[in-house]
């Protein structure tokens, strides 16, 4: 396959997330391990200068100096190599130098835990420019355990750089991942480094470590899955949902009824109602009237909205959530005053979100 | 700047297929990969499938797989959509999208594709 | 695949309102969500990416929160010119799935 580069030789674009290297070729520092390096923002009548590494803005720490216009980077590591950018910001303008630092090494390896390189999804860098592999976003790493629900889907990243480019596959608890080893196997995307597994169970616990490899180095991350049960339970409504509300003749009104429910949920928005002036039937139960309930035809069944409310719109409103399990029902009240009595409240057009899975 | 440019509108009959094109132009093809997501009038977006030229992979939504077919041409930057055994519920408009860091950040100007008899 | 579910599926405001609209997903997706703008006859525009960072060009009256499962958009005050329908997108998952998509409309 042909080799490639990210760096263009284009300016940023607007539309271009902040994050795509779009570049001419950047000048390129090298160091060995050990030791100090300066670099000289080359930009003129910088009033205030800001560094970033790799896309992510680079503040002065036990080893990295930031003077005026220089940069210092005393005992140089092969994590400090990267992408670098100077930015002088003027009254009426902007702009950016880069350049590349390569701190040569033997070979990398394991975990580069403190490294905080940018989000990119791979970066190609100057064909004569070899590089061992290297984390390129440890923030999408930082989370090892995940406690998963059976039937999700579980993604694991290990973004990295190198070049050659370097190649990843995965292990389970040690030993090589084949698709055989779970039905429905698994999806690996290459191009973000990533592994997708989908529907999992309680056989896919373990262990899954990424393996990163080109002919300089090799690094790896292990991630711990663990498959969580659900436990059914009877729908859970959240506290002080439907609320109480007011609202003017002619005015509209929204009650919302959060659900929390593992198995799938009825919900029902239920008003009591009188029939030939009686708020009970002969039976002595309640005459009821359902206004909305969830099913193919109901979007949102979460969401009572009520428009051009009259007089007869007040009253108790009662949210009835079932499952196979069980029911749970919370209710509020709704008070509609005339014209003249309008409650004082900010003009707001908010949506409340579907029952959670 | 970057830009993708599909080929034009199609008229189709059921059970025929249907080639659309999306040209890139202002940036590096093979460095993104290409989704391709189609809207039904009046309806929502719906994914299909996507290629990365440089990885060489190539992944298809559930319902059309077998029925689509996503390829690229890393010399003229183009990548194509094939879909076959069309039926009148394939009329929709097709867009070309380039995937970011897996988001989609710039859309082609959408192909119509109507299937009538 | 993972389900996104979209709400309200349409809403009526004024220009100046702040208007939110919401996007949960099936299961959690960690921040890999995305939002679309799209007009009658036009591509869809990346709004927002990451959850809540916002596309380089879009107004800053658009912002993006949440986590997991539950996700927001908001428009802190409606302007003509955002009278739209809007998606959110799941990129977690390889098999993208957008929301059914909120259509706001003029009062």
């Known amino acids: 396959r042909p080799s490639f580069s990210l760096v263009e030789d284009t300016t940023l674009e607007p539309e271009e997330p902040p994050t795509k290297y779009q570049i001419s070729q950047p000048e390129v520092y090298v160091a060995a391990p050990g030791e100090s390096l300066e670099v000289r923002c080359l930009l003129k009548d910088a009033a205030v200068i800001s560094w970033t590494k790799d896309g992510v803005h680079l503040g002065p720490n036990n080893r990295t100096v930031l003077i005026g216009e220089y940069l210092q980077i005393k005992g140089a590591t092969p994590r400090d190599s990267g992408l670098y950018a100077c930015t002088a910001s003027r009254t009426v303008d902007s702009e950016t130098w880069y350049f590349m630092v390569n701190v040569t090494d033997a070979i990398s390896s394991g975990d580069d835990e403190d490294d905080t390189d940018g989000a990119e999804d791979f970066v190609s860098e100057n064909s004569n420019n070899k590089r061992a592999p290297y984390w390129t976003n440890t923030e999408k790493m930082e989370k090892r355990l995940h406690a998963v629900p059976a039937a999700n889907t579980v993604k694991f990243r290990c973004p990295a750089g190198g070049n050659p480019m370097p190649t990843m596959r995965w292990l389970k608890n040690g030993k090589e991942f084949k698709q055989e080893h779970r039905i429905g196997g698994y999806k690996v995307r290459n191009q973000h480094w990533s592994l997708i597994m989908e529907s999992v169970v309680p056989s896919d616990k373990g262990n899954y470590t990424c393996v990163v490899e080109n002919e300089y180095g090799s690094i790896n991350h292990t991630y711990h899955l663990d498959v969580v049960e659900r436990s059914p339970h009877r729908p859970i409504l959240q506290a002080g949902l439907p609320a109480n509300a007011s609202t003017v003749v002619g005015g509209d009104v929204e009650f919302v009824c959060k659900v929390y429910s593992d198995a799938q949920p009825h919900i029902q928005w239920i008003k009591h109602v009188e029939k030939n002036g009686s708020k009970y039937g002969p039976d002595g139960l309640p005459y009821l009237k359902v206004l909305k309930h969830s099913g193919i035809n109901s979007s949102n069944a979460e969401v009572l909205a009520l428009f051009n409310v009259t007089e007869a719109d007040a009253g108790e409103y009662i949210c009835k959530v079932s499952n196979y399990i069980g029911q749970a029902n919370q209710s509020a009240w709704l008070t509609v005053l005339p014209k003249q009595q309008a409650p004082g409240r900010e003009k707001e057009i908010t949506a409340s979100p579907d029952y959670l899975e | 700047q970057v830009q993708l440019v599909q080929s034009g509108a199609e008229v189709k009959k059921p059970g025929s297929s249907v080639k659309v094109s999306c040209k890139a132009s202002g940036g590096t093809f093979s460095s993104y990969a290409i989704s391709w997501v189609r809207q039904a009038p009046g309806q929502g977006l719906e994914w299909m499938g996507y290629?990365?030229?440089?990885?060489?992979?190539?992944h298809y939504a559930q319902k059309f797989q077998g029925r689509v077919t996503i390829t690229a041409d890393e010399s003229t930057s183009t990548a194509y959509m094939e879909l076959s055994s069309l039926r009148s519920e394939d009329t929709a408009v097709y867009y070309c999208a380039r995937e970011s860091y897996e988001y989609f950040d710039i859309w082609g100007q959408g192909t119509l594709v109507t299937v009538s008899s | 695949d993972i389900q996104m579910t979209q709400s309200p599926s349409s809403l009526s405001a004024s220009v100046g309102d702040r208007v939110t609209i919401t996007c949960r997903a099936s299961q959690s997706i960690s921040n890999d969500l995305a939002w679309y703008q799209q007009k009658p006859g036009k591509a869809p525009k990346l709004l927002i990416y990451?959850?809540?960072i916002l596309q380089s060009g879009v107004p800053s009256r658009f912002s993006g929160s949440g986590s997991g499962t539950d996700f927001t958009l908001t428009i802190s005050s409606l302007q003509p010119e955002d009278f739209a329908t809007y998606y959110c997108?799941?990129?977690?998952?390889?098999?993208?799935?957008f929301g059914q998509g909120t259509k706001v409309e003029i009062k």
């Open positions: 990451a959850t809540s």
């Open positions: 290629i990365s030229p440089y990885m060489g992979e190539t």
């Open positions: 997108l799941q990129y977690y998952d390889y098999s993208y799935t």
